[in-house]
């Protein structure tokens, strides 16, 4: 037995025929000693008398609300939950499982940027005496702080037959860094309790996997003359992070006819315009990513050929201003070829996402992440990689993109993907480490040696365990050259001489 | 002892208005959500919806919304069922029934004796 | 909204039998299931909630048991006060939904 909260208890109960329950002593919140009587919310009948009462809890009926009286005057409650557990499994009877994007997920998180802010959502179809609490935090063994708000009804729909409804809530880490590469996953834990049944359920993640940003703003056409195409233009989403010249969008531009059986005509672009075909009757629609690390696209927003005009895609609110303004050179050093380590690490992102595309589908956490990886070198929020540090002295963070460069280059040229299960003919893995080696040369200045990480020693026994490391490197290998691009992106525009 | 006492019964025409009232006593009329349950003749039960009696708020089945009306009068202990432009498809017995719990709402525990309204053609 | 089929719609039985009703649900509905006794001219009584447990003064010939969509509720003997109505009632998801109903017969 646990307390949840002030006067509630969990009792945790293994549900089999005939189990024989939790003994539980309950006791009156009452300096009084004598004349104290029991009864229990749900029976009408005295169940007991003295300062404590010994119950057997088994099921449902042994659950609920005790209270302690005296002389017909309330002393105290004591509220009594039950948790099941069958099999050894918690139960999930409270939530629906939304099975995106995998069986079991009662949870869905999404952020619009990076500012540690993020909102969750579940779906029930239970609409009495219902509640939720949420608590959530980076890491769990040694927790930072993450504020949730209280979860609200967001939406009710009819499916079929049945009523669903949707609850959300917002949090907001409360030490964000979002130009860091996150180590450490966000936790949320939500307590729901219907009538007498307790269930928790929780979930996992890095915010860059949860990044959906709102779709772009301002999207207009301009007819071009003596051409049947337009120019078409948009925005970056007023809710999406700033500078935009450190976090960049891409953006994939489509036409579409009027019926859906029409062929989609697609244009993959960075920047916030591009030149289409539009004919009559179609809609041009734009949607956007990270330019850098494969997580969600926004929805669409859209705007009919016919005529030009605005879009009917969402714009949020909150956030300012686009790229900075250019910058001095960096001092106590040479500056770097910000252009050509850009270019190299924008396609290092590429490299990296076609040697794992599937990753963001797979929770690897949940293979006993911690020993296997906690050795690769992370961009930390001291590091100097945000905007500001690459302005003040951009060397702090060059040196440990470096490092890590150096890393990766050596656990990819390393047993761990030489060994077997051979890599494909055609595999990327090997372009990957060839660039990595590359930026890293790049990035190195003549006779200048940083110093770099001792590479662990990760010698896996067995191919599945080879696998799954690849899977892991690649994984955080994914977040760390994010990072870098965005610092060389950012560089090219602000800091080249 | 706990006791729900409905109103006697009732004989209506066509597009009239019936309110039934449910005195509870016994326990805190405010501690318990008060549900109404119709049964028309020789028919099943069909929950109609309830009124939680802390806050005054009601919750209606779809087959409930628009005609019908839960109130309170809670100094009286008293919950009301209000049928406005009353039908021959309303002709049934009505019951009030309390929830079992402060935790299990539409779980009925106790009832009305029932009220039995007719239409008169 | 959750249809809760009761079976048999009819008993006919002898004082001392045991009696078996079923009601299965068009969905599940967990354990939130009560079952109700209704005597001729009488307003309905609670016997089992949670599904298997016996309201404060039913007397314990009368059980119940299930989970998800299959519940089931026994009388081991049946005496000849049992004459009635029974009801099932799930009370997971609105609108909370009753069975249709076994009319209990005493031979």
């Known amino acids: 037995i646990w307390e949840l909260k002030k006067d509630v208890y969990v009792v945790e109960l293994d549900w089999y025929p005939d189990a024989p329950g939790e003994m539980v002593v309950l006791t009156c919140d009452t300096p009084e000693e004598d004349g104290i009587t029991w009864t229990l919310d749900q029976s009408s009948e005295v169940l007991g008398s003295g300062k404590t009462l010994t119950i057997q809890v088994k099921e449902f009926g042994d659950a609920g609300q005790y209270t302690c009286h005296k002389g017909g005057e309330v002393l105290s409650h004591s509220l009594l939950l039950l948790h099941k557990k069958e099999d050894g499994i918690w139960s999930t009877d409270i939530l629906k499982d939304q099975k995106e994007p995998k069986n079991k997920t009662f949870l869905r998180c999404e952020a619009k940027n990076y500012s540690g802010r993020f909102t969750c959502w579940w779906l029930t179809t239970i609409s009495t005496d219902l509640t939720f609490s949420v608590k959530s935090s980076r890491g769990s063994s040694d927790p930072q702080g993450v504020t949730c708000g209280a979860a609200t009804l967001s939406a009710e729909r009819v499916r079929g037959d049945n009523k669903e409804y949707e609850y959300s809530v917002e949090c907001q880490e409360d030490s964000a860094c979002p130009a860091a590469e996150e180590s450490l996953p966000i936790e949320v834990m939500v307590d729901a309790v219907h009538k007498l049944k307790y269930e928790n359920y929780t979930s996992s993640f890095f915010i860059r996997d949860i990044i959906k940003p709102d779709p772009p703003k301002n999207l207009q056409l301009k007819p071009l003359k003596n051409s049947r195409q337009v120019e078409v233009s948009w925005e970056y989403p007023d809710t999406w992070s700033t500078p935009h010249s450190y976090f960049s969008l891409t953006f994939c531009v489509q036409v579409q006819g009027k019926s859906k059986r029409e062929k989609k005509a697609r244009v993959f672009t960075d920047k916030t315009s591009a030149t289409v075909i539009c004919r009559k009757n179609a809609s041009i629609s734009v949607r956007a990513q990270d330019r850098y690390y494969s997580s969600s696209w926004s929805e669409w927003a859209s705007v009919p050929c016919s005529g030009s005009g605005s879009s009917r895609g969402g714009s949020g609110s909150g956030g300012s201003g686009g790229g900075g303004s250019k910058l001095r050179a960096v001092p106590g050093g040479s500056s770097p070829a910000w252009t050509q380590c850009q270019q190299l690490s924008q396609k290092l992102c590429t490299l990296a996402w076609s040697a794992h595309p599937l990753v963001g589908h797979m929770d690897l956490r949940e293979e006993g992440d911690e020993e296997t990886t906690n050795d690769v070198p992370h961009i930390q929020c001291g590091d100097g990689c945000d905007p500001q540090g690459l302005r003040d002295n951009s060397q702090f963070c060059l040196q440990r993109i470096h490092q890590g460069l150096i890393f990766y280059e050596k656990l990819l040229g390393s047993d761990i993907f030489t060994g077997e299960p051979s890599l494909l003919p055609d595999s990327p893995v090997g372009q990957l480490h060839a660039s990595l080696l590359g930026l890293s040369q790049l990035l190195q200045p003549e006779g200048h040696h940083w110093e770099t990480q001792q590479i662990p020693s990760l010698s896996p026994s067995q191919p599945w365990q080879r696998l799954l490391l690849r899977f892991k490197i690649l994984r955080s290998l994914q977040a760390f050259v994010a990072v870098a691009a965005r610092v060389f992106a950012h560089g090219a525009a602000t800091l080249s001489p | 002892q706990i006791q729900l006492v409905q109103s006697g019964p009732e004989l209506k025409k066509p597009g009239e208005t019936v309110k039934i009232s449910c005195k509870a006593s016994?326990?805190?009329?405010?501690?318990?959500?008060m549900n109404w349950v119709k049964q028309a003749p020789g028919k099943g039960l069909k929950w109609m919806g309830w009124?939680?009696?802390?806050?005054?708020?009601?919750t209606y089945a779809d087959d409930f919304k628009g005609r019908f009306a839960f109130s309170l009068e809670t100094s009286a202990s008293t919950a009301y069922l209000q049928i406005n432009n009353f039908k021959n498809e309303d002709t049934a017995t009505y019951f009030c029934?309390?929830?079992?719990?402060?935790?299990?709402?539409?779980?009925?525990?106790?009832w009305g004796q029932g009220t039995l309204v007719t239409v008169s053609s | 909204s959750i249809v809760m089929t009761q079976t048999p719609k009819f008993l006919l039985v002898s004082a001392g039998d045991r009696v078996t009703i079923t009601c299965k649900a068009s969905?599940?509905?967990?354990?939130?299931v009560a079952w109700y006794q209704q005597k001729p001219g009488q307003s309905p009584k609670l016997l089992i909630y949670?599904?298997?447990n016996r309201y404060t003064g039913v007397p314990d010939r009368f059980t119940g048991s299930g989970y998800g969509t299959d519940f089931t509720f026994t009388i081991s003997t049946v005496q000849a006060e049992d004459l009635a109505v029974y009801f099932c009632?799930?009370?997971?998801?609105?609108?909370?939904?009753f069975g249709g109903g076994t009319k209990l017969e005493i031979k």
């Open positions: 029934a309390r929830s079992l719990s402060t935790m299990i709402t539409t779980t009925f525990a106790y």
């Open positions: 016994g326990y805190t009329f405010t501690n318990y959500g």
């Open positions: 009124i939680n009696t802390y806050t005054g708020e009601p």
């Open positions: 969905q599940s509905v967990s354990n939130d």
């Open positions: 949670y599904a298997s």
């Open positions: 009632q799930q009370d997971y998801s609105s609108p909370y939904t």
